[in-house]
């Protein structure tokens, strides 16, 4: 009865190739770039999405101050190595044998090194701070209405359980959404906060990953909420390890 069954497409990931060659002729979808089978009734992992993207043809303030360990994804796109479950491998290397360690959202958390670099474990990003600036409006949005709408969005559009949306802060025109999810809180089948944040980031940029769904149409009491810039901070369960020269 799912859309994927009816016409053999993946409603939650347009970067797939689908065919009715699953068990019993069921629709099965595989991610571009990796060929990994994906579950179209949940979000696809960020690692598989990045890999698919790289394989595609090229075309008293209430605001939170991110602490000194917060990471921003300054390195941009790369073609990641994913494990069989679609998670980022702890060590990533490029074609020129430059390697680095990443966290669970694929953001670099060490200096770059060579092939001898060791990344003992995939460190979990347990706290994500999404920092948005909205376009000017006639007046400020009502905070509780904004809070409710953003919680609804993550619950309905990204399948993220409400308990993982820790807070929504607002000081016009800045909105901050805090997502928190410890290793112990995330169980099999639950959407990862990193994947939800990535889908949201792509939606805000007008690059929706959903198939056959309209783009993001955020409204607070009927008033359009248009985002003009986004910055995402990632906090890991273990602080990152950068040398001092990076900080100067």
């Amino acid at each position: 009865h799912t859309a994927a069954q009816d016409n053999c497409t993946c409603p939650t990931n347009k970067m797939t190739v689908c065919s009715p060659d699953g068990p019993g002729g069921r629709c099965q979808c595989r991610a571009l770039g990796s060929g990994v089978a994906v579950d179209c009734s949940t979000l696809t992992s960020k690692c598989l999405l990045l890999k698919a993207r790289m394989s595609a043809p090229k075309n008293a303030r209430t605001l939170v101050r991110p602490n000194e360990h917060a990471l921003v994804d300054n390195d941009g796109l790369y073609d990641p190595d994913c494990d069989p479950e679609g998670r980022f491998k702890a060590r990533q290397c490029n074609q020129t044998s430059v390697c680095w360690c990443v966290n669970s959202v694929g953001v670099r958390r060490t200096d770059k090194g060579d092939l001898s670099l060791r990344c003992d474990e995939l460190v979990r990003t347990h706290h994500i701070l999404i920092d948005l600036r909205h376009r000017p409006t006639a007046g400020a949005f009502n905070h509780s209405d904004l809070d409710a709408e953003l919680r609804r969005l993550f619950r309905e559009r990204y399948r993220l359980h409400p308990k993982f949306v820790a807070a929504v802060h607002y000081e016009q025109p800045t909105i901050q959404i805090e997502l928190r999810q410890n290793t112990s809180q995330k169980a099999a089948g639950d959407v990862d906060i990193g994947d939800a944040a990535y889908y949201f980031e792509r939606d805000v940029k007008g690059e929706s990953l959903f198939q056959g769904r309209g783009g993001l149409d955020l409204r607070v009491r009927g008033e359009p909420l248009q985002v003009e810039r986004t910055l995402i901070y990632y906090l890991d369960e273990i602080p990152p390890k950068f040398s001092m020269k990076r900080l100067t």
Partner: nanobody, 123 residues
Framework: QVQLQESGGGSVQAGGSLRLSCVVS????????MAWFRQAPGKEREGVAG???????TYKPSVEGRFTISRDSAKRTLYLQMNSLKPEDTAMYYC?????????????????WGQGTQVTVSS
């Protein structure tokens, strides 16, 4: 293979009540979220009520206060108690499940569906 079987539908006068049931079989885990959806002739399928593994619930605004979703994990059964029924509640009602813990009423997140049970409310 997971299977869902609904029951409890029927015809009722406006203002009346019905209780729908849905028996789940074939799951090897208890970590699945469940929901009731409905589809009236010529209309899109819409989410009515959902329940997660922690028994938190969510409802379509037009049924909140009239409908109650609940689940009995031991009996692997989902229920929908429908009170103060209105003619606009007339539809085929479907039970659905999705792996993991979530609270959403978008059909895209649910991968197993029952065959449905008809509810008809006359004025």
């Amino acid at each position: 293979q997971v299977q869902l079987q609904e029951s409890g539908g029927g015809s009722v006068q406006a203002g009346g009540s019905l209780r729908l049931s849905c028996v789940v079989s074939g799951y090897t885990t208890t970590r699945y979220s469940m929901a009731w959806f409905r589809q009236a002739p010529g209309k899109e399928r819409e989410g009515v009520a959902g329940i997660d593994t922690d028994v938190l619930t969510t409802y379509k605004p037009s049924v909140e206060g009239r409908f109650t979703i609940s689940r009995d994990s031991a009996k692997r059964t989902l229920y929908l108690q429908m009170n103060s029924l209105k003619p606009e509640d007339t539809a085929m009602y479907y039970c659905a499940t999705g792996t993991g813990n979530f609270l959403a009423l978008d059909p895209v997140w649910y991968n197993t569906w029952g065959q449905g049970t008809q509810v008809t409310v006359s004025s």
